[in-house]
Interface confidence: low
């Protein structure tokens, strides 16, 4: 190899050992029969050398540094050349370094031709191995602006007082151009300005100078984003730290098109703006730090640019001003496992503060919009508490459990609407009366409606789930002893069309001791399946539930149990079932922990089924499934 550097080129070439490898055989630079491990070539020198091994790239690296002095004479602006040409250099991992020194009053601009640059964080590497490391200067201190790969959005970086640019090329890379030019600009009066250009949808992750170490004290850094007017940009902070400020406050400032309050100032911990149309600037301003305990200011953030969906231009008013004790959360559905880039999906309050989830509370009117490629990625969960503190005031009072129409008109699917119904202990109970009779969801007869009501105890210590109920059955009402939650859960987008079928009224009634009472009025020729609460986990200890089953005058009811034995084993107490004719009061009592369950029985009049549990041994729980079928009395039942 021969390397000749022109006089006054201000170029130095250094060949040195790279990261030591565990290769058994050493390798040397051979020059005039001398074996050396480092070679420095300065301006005006010409050196011929070779290597003592076949694969020098496994041992050596080459650094080519060009010093550009803009202090004492004119600055060589324009496209930067790779000197010496890569074709003249040995095939080693090589780093070209340009060190430009200039006056504080002169701005220097690095312009990157396409492909533009993409900033990477600590520990990351570039897929093709080509990296651009850029640093600036504050007096004598070097400040790292960042490390960049190809194929990004960064088109220009402006600095003042000097810039150091290092381009690292792996030995096998064919690149023979620097890919950037230098221009002079007026003073920028800050550490640097980074321009990021989006030509279509995409995202960029950017970092404060010196990241992950601290941003220089009391400095200012600006990012300029060029975004086509038809697209929308959202900013989210991925990671930040605040230092200990003695004077001034660390903050970010935005210049946003169309804003009447430019600059808009945000704390780093604030939600950052979203749904911005067109170009905007973001600046990071440091503070005077506490000398004893400075801490560090650092910021890593992402800008996401995407098409506004039809929805992003629509404002939805959610009027919760007349509601009490209610919260509405719009949030992402649990994601399936996708690792590819997906555009962001945000919900925006007042069109500006956008985040992936948003909770609205009662007592106010809220204006929201969406910035999302696919609104099916979001869903809504609502919680409302209806509580009675004074039993004298609440008794016989009724409330309609209806999803407010404002919520149904939102373009996001409702997942759960939960009503927490609270009553004074041992004073009042509750009765749920549906607009349409309900069916209990069972394996034998599953619900296939677009929504169900999930009814469960709301007493923290009590694990009691009454079941899942949907319209189109035989359950006329459900009475419960104490606090419960009723959750309307939707299963299909068709809920919007079926919303009229929802409708449940809750009334506060005098207290009763049973955990629950189901009033069942079966329809002719349909089999009603009923099961004990807490199916699969067993009816809780010492719990009693009843079914009040109506039999019309011209019908007969067949009661069938689906097991021979209940399977319960009692640790203490007895588990029993009472079947009682309501007209004659005649009753049959079955010991569930001892007797076999009754064979199918026929009832000509309305009757009760009451099941009371003992304290069962673990694993031997009480779960019963039974059915009721009506047939006309004229049929010969023998």
């Amino acid at each position: 190899f021969e390397i000749a550097l022109p006089r006054e080129s201000n170029i130095t070439v250094l060949i040195k050992l790279g990261t030591p490898t565990l290769l058994a055989k050493p390798c040397y630079i051979v020059i005039s029969k001398r074996h050396i491990t480092m070679l420095s070539i300065k301006s005006g020198e010409r050196i011929v050398f070779t290597f003592s091994c076949q694969s020098p790239e496994n041992h050596f690296v080459i650094e080519i540094q060009k010093n550009i002095d803009c202090m004492s004479g004119p600055c060589p602006f324009g496209e930067v050349q790779l000197q010496p040409s890569t074709s003249l250099l040995p095939t080693l991992n090589r780093t070209f370094i340009w060190d430009v020194k200039a006056h504080k009053s002169i701005g220097l601009e690095l312009q990157f031709s396409i492909p533009r640059l993409r900033q990477i964080g600590p520990g990351e590497s570039c897929p093709d191995g080509v990296t651009h490391s850029i640093s600036g200067r504050i007096d004598a201190t070097v400040v790292r602006i960042g490390t960049f790969c190809s194929n990004g959005t960064v088109s220009r970086i402006k600095m003042q007082e000097g810039v150091k640019m290092a381009l690292h090329l792996p030995w096998f890379h064919p690149r023979n151009v620097s890919g950037f030019s230098i221009a002079n600009r007026s003073s920028i009066k800050r550490l640097c300005i980074i321009e990021s250009v989006f030509e279509g949808e995409g995202s960029a992750t950017l970092m404060s100078a010196n990241y992950p170490e601290g941003f220089p004290e009391d400095e200012l850094m600006t990012w300029q984003f060029v975004v086509p007017a038809h697209l929308r940009a959202s900013v989210s902070f991925l990671n930040f730290n605040l230092s200990n400020c003695e004077r001034k406050e660390e903050r970010v400032e935005y210049y946003i098109p169309g804003s009447t309050t430019n600059p808009e100032v945000f704390k780093l911990e604030d939600k950052q703006p979203g749904n911005m149309a067109g170009n905007f600037n973001l600046s990071l301003q440091g503070c005077d730090q506490d000398a004893q305990s400075p801490g560090i200011l650092r910021l890593q953030f992402q800008v996401l640019v995407q098409h506004p969906q039809n929805e992003s231009n629509k404002i939805y008013v959610v009027d919760l001003s007349n509601e009490r004790a209610m919260s509405l959360t719009i949030e992402p559905r649990p994601v399936k496992q996708s690792r590819k880039f997906v555009p962001g999906c945000f919900v925006c309050l007042e069109s500006r503060t956008c985040s992936s989830n948003l909770t609205l509370t009662s007592g106010s009117k809220h204006k929201i919009s969406f910035l999302c490629d696919d609104l099916t990625r979001l869903w809504m969960n609502v919680e409302k508490t209806i509580s009675c503190t004074d039993h004298r005031y609440c008794q016989r009072k009724s409330y309609s459990l209806q999803v407010p129409s404002d919520i149904l008109h939102l373009p996001v699917e409702l997942h759960d609407f939960s009503w927490k119904l609270l009553v004074p202990k041992d004073r009042l109970s509750l009765v749920l009366v549906p607009a349409q009779k309900l069916q209990q969801h069972t394996h034998e007869k599953p619900c296939n409606t677009s929504f169900s009501y999930l009814v469960a105890s709301a007493i923290p210590s009590q694990d009691l789930y009454f079941g899942s109920f949907c319209p189109g059955g035989s359950i006329k009402q459900i009475q419960v002893k104490q606090n419960i939650s009723v959750t309307l859960r939707t299963f299909a987008p068709s809920f919007q069309q079926e919303a009229s079928r929802q409708g449940l009224t809750v009334s506060f009634i005098p207290y009763f001791k049973e955990e629950g009472v189901f009033t069942v009025t079966p329809d002719t020729k349909s089999k009603v399946y009923l099961r004990t609460p807490n199916w699969d986990r067993g009816l809780p200890s010492l719990t009693s539930v009843s079914w009040n089953i109506s039999v019309p005058r011209d019908q007969v009811a067949c009661l069938t149990f689906f097991k021979e034995r209940s399977g319960v084993v009692c640790q203490t107490g007895r588990a029993f079932m009472i079947i009682q004719e309501q007209r004659t009061r005649a009753e049959e009592i079955f010991s569930l922990d001892e007797d076999v369950l009754p064979k199918p029985s026929f009832h000509h009049h309305s009757f009760w089924v009451n099941i009371s549990n003992c304290s069962p041994t673990s694993g031997k729980q009480l779960d019963l499934l039974f059915s009721v079928t009506l047939t006309p009395r004229t049929v010969d039942l023998t």
């Epitope: 600590p122 520990g123 649990p334 994601v335 399936k336 496992q337 996708s338 690792r339």
Partner: antibody, heavy 119, light 107 residues
């Protein structure tokens, strides 16, 4: 409750194939990713790969590309691991595990299936 | 790929003592690290997710800490049933990797 139940132990000859099944119950299979982990006798855990249960697309760790195939039958809520051209060094316990979240942690595991390859 | 190195390979303690298990990553993985316990003949069990988040049903004596490349699993007072092998797992990027394990044995 959530359960992953794997098929029983297998004794195979070198060069043969084996198909290990993992039946999911107590949750919807397509709501969570399914991962496979190998543990050779007396050794540690090795992540083999995962299958996107929604799309059926598998991803393999480098050491498990080629002879290892991950598949699904959502109609029976079951994930499968098939190994072809078995070698003695494939002798191990193979676990399926359910992945939670975007960057998974494995909250439920199958009981493991011992595959022994011996002539 | 991320290489996880656990230390010590074996830790001998008596019941009631404090156990400190270490896991070091070959590069920064933020908090994408989970801990598992495995007893002989059993499947692994998730103990801690995302370096320090507790798991429902896992005793409070198990805690995790760390971020970046250094992580610690602490058992404040070892119980007889805690003697097992403990693995850390990176979920930072494909391929997900496990540490080689730390065996906690009775002294």
């Amino acid at each position: 409750q959530v359960q992953l139940v794997q098929s029983g132990s297998e004794l195979k000859k070198p060069g043969a194939s084996v198909k290990v099944s993992c039946k999911a119950s107590g949750y919807t299979l397509t709501d969570f990713s399914m991962h496979w982990v190998r543990q050779a006798p007396g050794q540690g855990l090795e992540w083999m790969g995962w299958i996107n249960t929604e799309t059926g697309a598998p991803t393999y760790a480098d050491d498990f590309k080629g002879r290892f195939v991950l598949s699904l039958d959502t109609s029976v809520s079951t994930a499968y691991l098939q190994i072809s051209s078995l070698k003695a060094e494939d002798t191990a316990v193979y676990y399926c595990s359910r992945g939670r979240d975007y960057d998974p942690h494995f909250d439920y595991w199958g009981q493991g299936t011992l595959v022994t390859v011996s002539s | 790929e991320i290489v996880l190195t656990q230390s010590p390979a074996t830790l001998s303690l008596s019941p009631g003592e404090r156990a400190t298990l270490s896991c070091r990553a070959s590069q920064s993985i933020s908090d994408f690290l989970h801990w598992y316990q495995q007893k002989p003949g059993q499947s692994p069990r998730l103990l801690i997710k995302y370096a320090s988040q507790s798991i429902s049903g896992i005793p409070a004596r198990f805690s995790g800490s760390g971020s970046g490349s250094d992580f610690t699993l602490t058992i404040s007072s070892v119980e007889p049933e805690d003697f097992a092998v403990y693995y850390c797992q990176s979920a930072h990027s494909f391929p997900y990797t496990f540490g080689q394990g730390t065996k906690l044995e009775i002294k």
